[in-house]
């Protein structure tokens, strides 16, 4: 059997909103589901379509979706068919319409004292509630001789008089929302004694010290009164003018003339017409003083030939709004062509080099004129004055690579070394003209260099190979003072480089030849067994054909390397007692002893009363405290050699002797007793 596990149900829906009629079935066989609307199959559209077996509404339509929907499930094999419950939409909607004259039949028939009925053509479901307005003000039942039924769409004015004149509009609301009349109705019921506008004053803008004229005329039977007021409700008449309106004249026809206008005259002027009956008719006009502000500065612009560019001129603030135009070489630009003005923009189509120069944006109104220049440069691709060339640079001296180009604007030059951008530092300097200076040329500066010269129009580049002419030098220079250990084998190296591989030889400084137990092996001086006589001054000589020779002097000292005769031992001392750390070293030259405690050298001149370093190198600390605990290092050094040895010092509390212990009982640990 076909079973519905979701069924469509009747529901509220909003016009134009999403809705859903669900239908899901369970059945043993393959079931085909379709929908009926008032018995006719539903066709899918973009607005209403099946999703799965449910019917989805992207936007409910009150006309197309009214009726009864039903979901039908059919087993095409067995022919079995099941139908869901019927479902329909209660569609809520509201639609705006105009306010129309229902009675009398035409506007021409509207006379004072006749009944006028207006109808509000806003429709909706559920039935809307209506509200009427005259000149934007809500009307309520029984107000000023009009009968209004807010539930109904009709507004009856009985009898209609001039006081009912105005713009009638209506709004309505229901559960869907609110709508107001799409077109309103102007009811005009004339009363000859009411003041009627013949000529209304217009807003004016005048320049300082110029004159301004406001025209104002009313008509009525009998003729109406006309009065002018300024801002602060001050009346303006030819007999009594306010102090700031001394130059105001009211003409017989109602016009108001202001001469030599000043800023204080700017403001709102009211022309009031009063008939024998009816309300006063108030007309307003504003006098503005013309003004114009300064224009913002232009940044200079750089364009490339062949491109299309635009420069916008922001007009200055002003009243009236300033007109804007562009000039070049004193001539106003046309509105079409290759270089022309479009709106406030300067347009340069397919720029040529000849377009470069100063362009001026002008702005003007009644208050005056302003101008601002913009300098336009047409960029060109750089051309070579001098390309970088393959160069031989001497090591240790400054070297120069040239990259001289010209273009508009002045090109920027960057250099690359082995494809890496050179950033200026203490060794590299790029001059304004593009030349690269390498200060103190080094061997590894021998590589490829590339310079790139650019403007917005394009760039050019060239590269050059640098070969470094190496100077003759020791690598590394031998240490001027060196020590050799007595009775041991020793070597003293010496090596050098140059443009050609140099020859290296050793000799004694006094020119005497080397003894037979001393050999010179490719620059390494070798002592098979060092004797006291080997001490002295030696010279290493490096030479080649093109660069000559260089010399390095070395003073060799023969020494007995340091050994410790006595080393400090791990020591434990009672607090308040004296600690002795012994240290004795031997060597030639005779070594000096220094002590380091708690990671700082103990300066014998600043030791204080508790510490003392003896001539033989031993360190004594009196009245030891817990903070004296730590590692102590004995450092023995001479001009040739330095050695160190260390031991810890522990400071402990003296134990209180128990009664059972005799006076001769030994302490619980090995220690120094003083």
């Amino acid at each position: 059997a076909i079973v519905f596990i979701k069924q469509p149900s009747s529901q509220d829906a909003l016009q134009g909103r999403r809705a859903l009629l669900r239908c899901e079935v369970e059945a043993p066989g393959l079931v085909h589901v379709y929908w009926l609307l008032d018995g006719a199959p539903v066709q899918d559209t973009e607005r209403r379509f099946t999703q799965g077996s449910s019917l989805s509404f992207a936007a409910v339509d009150r006309l197309q979706d009214s009726g009864t929907f039903q979901c039908v499930a059919r087993d095409d094999v067995t022919g079995e068919e099941a139908r869901s419950a019927n479902a329909s939409f209660n569609i809520k909607w509201i639609e705006a319409g105009p306010v129309v004259l229902k009675h009398p039949a035409s506007e021409a028939e509207i006379q004072p004292q006749t009944q006028v009925t207006l109808r509000c053509h806003i429709d909706g479901h559920p039935r809307p509630t209506y509200q009427w307005f005259r000149d934007g003000t809500p009307l309520s039942d029984g107000q000023s001789n009009n009968t209004v039924s807010s539930k109904e769409r009709n507004l009856t004015l009985r009898p209609a008089g001039p006081e009912h004149s105005g713009l009638y509009s209506c709004c309505a609301h229901n559960a869907f929302g609110q709508a107001c009349s799409s077109q309103n109705f102007t009811l005009s019921i004339a009363d000859e004694s009411f003041a009627r506008v013949v000529l209304a004053p217009q807003d004016v803008i005048v320049a300082r010290n110029e004159e301004a004229m406001f025209h104002c005329q009313f008509s009525a039977q009998p003729p109406p009164n006309l009065q002018w007021l300024f801002e602060d409700e001050t009346p303006i008449t030819n007999r009594s003018r306010p102090p700031h309106l001394r130059r105001a004249t009211v003409f017989a026809n109602g016009s108001l003339l202001l001469t030599q206008v000043r800023p204080r005259n700017a403001g709102v002027y009211r022309c009031i017409g009063q008939g024998q009956r009816g309300p006063p008719v108030i007309l307003e006009a504003t006098l503005h003083l013309a003004e114009i502000e300064d224009m913002p500065l232009f940044e200079p612009r750089v364009f490339t030939a062949g491109s299309e560019e635009r420069v916008t001129c922001l007009p200055p603030k002003g009243l009236p709004e300033p007109s804007v135009w562009w000039e070049h070489a004193g001539v106003r630009l046309p509105t079409h062509g290759r270089v022309y003005q479009k709106g406030h923009e300067l347009v340069l189509a397919s720029i040529a080099e000849s377009d470069a120069g100063v362009y001026t944006c002008h702005a003007a109104n009644l208050a005056g004129q302003r101008r601002q220049d913009v300098n336009i440069t047409v960029a060109t691709v750089p051309t070579w004055l001098k390309k970088p060339q393959d160069s031989q640079l001497e090591e240790g001296k400054p070297g120069y690579l040239h990259c001289l180009t010209q273009a508009t604007p002045k090109p920027t030059v960057v250099w690359y070394r082995n494809q890496m951008l050179i950033s200026e530092d203490s060794r590299f300097e790029v001059f304004k003209n593009g030349t690269l200076r390498i200060n103190n040329v080094e061997v590894y500066d021998g590589t490829w260099y590339r310079c790139v010269s650019s403007t917005p129009a394009g760039s050019i580049e060239a590269q050059a190979r640098v070969q470094v002419l190496e100077k003759l030098k020791f690598t590394p220079p031998p240490q001027p003072q060196q020590c050799m250990e007595f009775d041991k084998e020793a070597t003293v190296p010496c090596s050098a480089t140059g443009r050609e591989k140099p020859t290296i030889k050793w000799e004694r400084a006094d020119g005497s030849s080397l003894p037979e137990w001393v050999t010179d092996n490719a620059g390494t001086l070798h002592f098979a067994r060092v004797t006291r006589d080997d001490a002295g001054n030696y010279t290493c000589i490096a030479s080649n054909g093109p660069q000559g020779q260089i010399r390095a002097h070395v003073q060799l000292t023969v020494a007995v390397f340091i050994t410790f005769k006595v080393e400090p031992e791990r020591t434990t001392v009672y607090q308040g007692h004296t600690a002795l750390l012994q240290c004795e070293a031997q060597g030639d030259p005779k070594p000096l002893i220094q002590w380091k405690g708690k990671d700082r050298i103990l300066d014998p001149t600043k030791l204080g009363p508790r510490m003392h370093i003896f001539q033989n190198g031993s360190l004594v600390i009196h009245d030891v405290a817990p903070e004296d605990s730590g590692r102590y290092t004995c450092i023995a050094g001479n001009s040739c050699n330095i050695k160190h040895t260390e031991a810890p010092l522990y400071v402990v509390d003296k134990p209180v002797p128990e009664e059972s212990e005799g006076p001769g009982s030994p302490p619980p640990y090995k220690m120094i007793q003083t």
Epitope: V3, F4, I5, K6, Q7, P8, S9, Q11, R18, L20, L21, R22, Q51, G52, S54, S56, A58, A85, A87
Partner: antibody, heavy 119, light 111 residues
Framework: QVQLQQPGAELVKPGASVKLSCRAS????????MHWVKQRPGRGLEWIGW????????KYNEKFKSKTTLTVDKPSSTAYMQLNSLTSEDSAVYYC????????????WGQGTTLTVSS | DIVLTQSPASLAVSLGQRATISCRAS??????????MNWFQQKPGQPPKLLIY???NQGSGVPARFSGSGSGTDFSLNIHPMEEDDTAMYFC?????????FGSGTKLEIK
Amino acid sequence: QVQLQQPGAELVKPGASVKLSCRASGYTFTTYWMHWVKQRPGRGLEWIGWIDPNSGTTKYNEKFKSKTTLTVDKPSSTAYMQLNSLTSEDSAVYYCARGDSNYDYFDYWGQGTTLTVSS
Amino acid sequence: DIVLTQSPASLAVSLGQRATISCRASESVDNYGISFMNWFQQKPGQPPKLLIYAASNQGSGVPARFSGSGSGTDFSLNIHPMEEDDTAMYFCQQSKEVPFTFGSGTKLEIK
């Protein structure tokens, strides 16, 4: 107006069965589905299942499938829920609720039957 | 099963102020472009009462101060302005798929 009437309380012994009733009035009984919901203090609300009074079609929460049987009597517009093999865990308030078959929301609820399973 | 997590567990709001209750689903409860999320109010000793269905539609006779919003997995119930009578437990419930599940509830009180 729509009303769903349920007995106030039922007291049954563990292991026994009970059949809770829900009598509908104020609307067409076969147009809406009837849902059953369990509520225990501190445990929130649990949906048990629904029955379509028109076709007798049922849909259960897998958790309650072996415990529950939903039936209707169309002439009396009454829905029933039978609970078997009762334990203290079945002690709760059981509500019947009218359900919209399209959106499956429960718009009207019975006052609930308090079921106490105790020896 | 779709799990609904309500927050906060309890909430105190001054009269006239706005109360907002959130409900997050472990997976989307949207289908056919509709969010199948409903909200209920329950007072002590009474059955739950439908406030909102399909995420944002008001139940019959429900005051306009109750409104619902959200889609996918995140939903909220707003009450503004808060009134004395709104003190109750509030539950969200998904009806996208069986088994229909409820949130654990939010207790709303007057501050």
